[in-house]
């Protein structure tokens, strides 16, 4: 056969669907690999062909579109399962071709089992909402295209295993779930179960979102350096180990890049001849505020090291901060003034 542009296995699209539920999977060619859409391709005389490789097999085989009740069907660029079965797991390929042109891509599909409390190996999207903000809505995700707008499905929301009824600050409103003045106790997995009729059968869609309540933008600050500070003097004798922690608090800021670093006499540790070790640790509060600690240590400090200027620096999207450590030689009466 003619050469085919093979985009390989698109592992970026690790599609997971629940067992015994409908699933509609769009051919990724038109979303990520080709510049034109299905309608344009179809009107140009190109045909979309589907096939698959079962889990733990190497043999590519055509998809059986003649199953009872049209369990698997294709509609335009969408492959439909009504519903899925566990053994539908495998790598699926969609190929667009005519006599002179061919392009194909494969993607993995995993059919996942769930228990009665919606626990499963499914990876859930995380939705971050700001603590104490007025109202925050989440919408039952990935249900578009499953039923026409004329169909009004029933929607039931759960937190964990518990149906959301008379929750004080969480209100189900059809496809939406509203949170009023959210608190950390609102953290958790929220599941919507959408039930809709089709051709005399009832289908269920289960979708889970992990809610994480985080610090509010109104509370966002530049970094706050707890240590070093003006109250603590690192007084050492030559030959002793010098250990200075740089402990910095960063309030949660969405997509902020938090940085902590040391300078010694204005230079990065890598650019000085001193034998320095730096170890970093990070801890998080319940609202994802971050405390980042960088411990600078010199195993055997020299008199020269005790005269150097050690400055802790921190930066986030709100600003920068810096603080010098007070280092002096034991028995030496004077403390070198630190110039910032």
């Amino acid at each position: 056969s003619e050469r085919c542009d093979d985009w390989g296995l698109d592992t970026m699209r690790q599609i997971q669907v629940f067992e015994d539920e409908p699933a509609r999977i769009k051919c990724p060619l038109f979303e990520h690999f080709l510049k034109y859409n299905y309608s344009t391709a179809h009107s140009s005389g190109l045909t979309l062909i589907w096939y698959w490789t079962r889990q733990d097999r190497d043999l590519e085989e055509p998809i059986n579109f003649r199953l009872p009740e049209n369990r698997i069907s294709k509609e335009k660029d969408v492959l439909w399962f009504r519903p899925t079965l566990l053994n539908d797991t495998g790598n699926y390929t969609c190929m667009l071709r005519n006599t002179t042109y061919c392009s194909k891509v494969a993607f993995p599909l995993e059919v996942v089992q769930k228990d009665s409390c919606f626990n499963s190996a499914m990876r859930f999207p995380v939705h971050k909402m700001y603590i104490e903000h007025g109202i925050h809505k989440i919408t039952c995700p990935n249900v578009d295209g499953y039923f026409p707008s004329s169909v009004k499905p029933s929607v039931t929301w759960y937190k964990g295993c518990t149906e959301i009824v008379d929750f004080h600050n969480v209100l189900p409103e059809g496809m939406n779930l509203s949170f009023f003045i959210p608190l950390v106790s609102n953290n958790g997995n929220y599941t919507c179960v959408v039930t809709y009729p089709e051709n005399g059968r009832l289908f269920h869609l289960t979708r889970t979102v992990t809610v994480k309540v985080v610090g509010s933008p109104k509370d966002a600050l530049p970094p706050q350096i707890y240590s070093p500070n003006d109250r603590v003097v690192y007084e050492k004798e030559p030959g002793e180990e010098l250990v200075i922690p740089c402990k910095v608090y960063f309030s949660f800021i969405m997509d902020s890049h938090n940085e902590v670093w040391w300078t010694i006499d204005g230079k990065k540790p890598d650019d000085v001849t001193v034998d320095i070790t730096i170890n970093e640790s990070v801890s998080y509060s319940s609202t994802e505020d971050e405390t980042r600690t960088q411990i600078l240590s010199i195993k055997k400090v020299t008199p020269e090291d005790l005269r150097r200027n050690y400055v802790c620096h921190a930066r986030n999207t709100k600003g920068e901060a810096e603080q010098a450590a007070k280092v002096k030689q034991k028995g030496n009466g004077c403390t070198e003034p630190m110039t910032l």
């Epitope: 903000h133 600050n169 009023f180």
Partner: antibody
Framework: EVQLLESGGGLVQPGGSLRLSCAAS????????MTWVRQAPGKGLEWVSA????????LYADSVKGRFTISRDNSKNTLYLQMNSLRAEDTAVYYC???????????WGQGTLVTVSS | EIVMTQSPATLSVSPGERATLSCRAS??????LAWYQQKPGQAPRLLIY???TRATGIPARFSGSGSGTEFTLTISSLQSEDFAVYYC?????????FGQGTKVEIK
Amino acid sequence: EVQLLESGGGLVQPGGSLRLSCAASGFTFSQFGMTWVRQAPGKGLEWVSAISYDGEGTLYADSVKGRFTISRDNSKNTLYLQMNSLRAEDTAVYYCARFRYYTAFDYWGQGTLVTVSS
Amino acid sequence: EIVMTQSPATLSVSPGERATLSCRASQSVSSNLAWYQQKPGQAPRLLIYGASTRATGIPARFSGSGSGTEFTLTISSLQSEDFAVYYCQQYNNWPWTFGQGTKVEIK
């Protein structure tokens, strides 16, 4: 200095209405959630209602839901509680308080007495 | 809603003695618990938040401990101005709820 000053209390007949106000000063009002707490004579404290700092989110105790409305005007640094369909059991001193999740109700007003009686 | 239960209802203590007040939540409130002091004719005053952090201006003789469902407020050496009613409050879940109060009176 943070100050909260309630007003608008008084004697009202059952079924009547009253509007309480709470004037705030000494802090950036628009940055804080606010709440109303009441205390019936000789009894304990009961949370009544809360409003988010932006005024969009409101919550109510079941005992007042549908009858009371909390609101705020950040341009006037003022919190309100509109009380309708008042009942004898609503008789209490009403306090406004500032709240944050991290520190609970950290500042309180001195309270205003609402008496519902015929 | 979370029910907060305080004990004892009344505590009789001599000045200079230690007072220990208990508060129990019907379900875990993590460390989201506050203690308030209220004197007759006055508004409540925040003493402790986060179960153990003293509010601004609160003397060191007041200390809080506990997490989850069991909490304690300790007044190490009672002063005359400490005789009042003390309330615990959870602010982990809406609605935020108070205990019924413990009255600390002079023995």
